[in-house]
Interface confidence: medium
């Protein structure tokens, strides 16, 4: 279920854009980064695609948003929300957040100035 983000700007417009893109490559890319490429994680066989390929696919998907820069925080929040239940301890949560905040830079986008990733009602 999608949470209310209540961000500055037109968050509903960003929400629609985030809904339209496939964030799975981003989620898989980050999981690969924190779990290691040698491991299978839950339902994803993350060995099937190299991390660099996943990163490119992730960046391509983020680029599909009309307002990539403005809606980047909403996209990062949605990735966090989607993967929250898969993160089983504090350390994984910290690593996931760190990798997530590096994502815009990896895709040559500007990082959002303020982006609160603690959006999952205490779940993450």
């Amino acid at each position: 279920m999608r949470r209310e983000r209540g961000r500055q700007g037109d968050s509903s417009s960003c929400e629609r854009q985030v809904d339209r893109v496939n964030l799975k490559p981003c989620e898989q890319h980050i999981m690969q980064r924190i779990m290691g490429e040698q491991e299978q994680y839950d339902s994803y066989d993350i060995r099937s695609t190299r991390s660099s390929d996943q990163q490119q696919r992730c960046c391509d998907e983020l680029n599909e948003m009309e307002n990539t820069q403005r809606c980047m925080c909403e996209a990062l929040q949605q990735i966090m929300e989607n993967q929250c239940d898969r993160l089983q301890d504090r350390q994984m949560v910290q690593q996931f957040k760190r990798e997530l905040m590096n994502l815009p830079q990896q895709c040559n986008f500007r990082a959002p100035q303020r982006c609160d990733l603690d959006v999952s009602g205490g779940r993450c």
Epitope: G36, D85, D89, R90, Q91, Q94, G122, R123
Partner: antibody
Amino acid sequence: EFQLVQSGSELRKPGASVKVSCKASGYTFTKYGMNWVRQAPGQGLEWMGWINTNTAKPTYAQDFTGRFVFSLDTSVNTAYLEISGLKAEDTAVYYCATDGSEGSWGQGTTVTVSA
Amino acid sequence: DIQMTQSPSTLFASVGDRVTITCRASQSIGTWLAWHQQKPGTAPKVLIYKASNLKSGVPSRFSGSGSGTDFTLTISSLQPDDVATYYCQQYNTYLGTFGQGTRVEIK
């Protein structure tokens, strides 16, 4: 097999220091944070804090700041708890433990502080 | 700091009984809750992580539920081997807190 093996019992005088080790095996050491837990005789479990095995950043519970230090040696997959300025009330069993889906506990190390 | 309150502190039940232990957090912790079992003279062991996930190797008679502030550990059919003290632990924040423990005994 996922295992945490702790160092043996220690007897120390008040004011001395002690270093407890916790050696991990059967998994990638840097994958899970390491918690430290104290259990005084006949008492419940007290969470002392944890150390991020990836970044080596320790987090201490309020009652365990100052004399307590968490550290790592990732080359030998080992976490350490060092207590300085030991007091009689530090007499307890100290446990290391990981959390999450692979949550596991060490067997405990008894530290006795006595003059 | 988040406080964890367990009840009851001691529980007497017969073999085969359904046993329920509750744990309440002083503020919402989502599902960041674990249940641990400690038998006399031994180290604790993890039964349940993230509120409802049964750790591998733990008998299926143990189950956990809840989210937010209210959590439950249930033993569907109490066995003599289940005599122990049970602790809930929150690990929602970068800190973690244990409940005071519930001693389960056979009556």
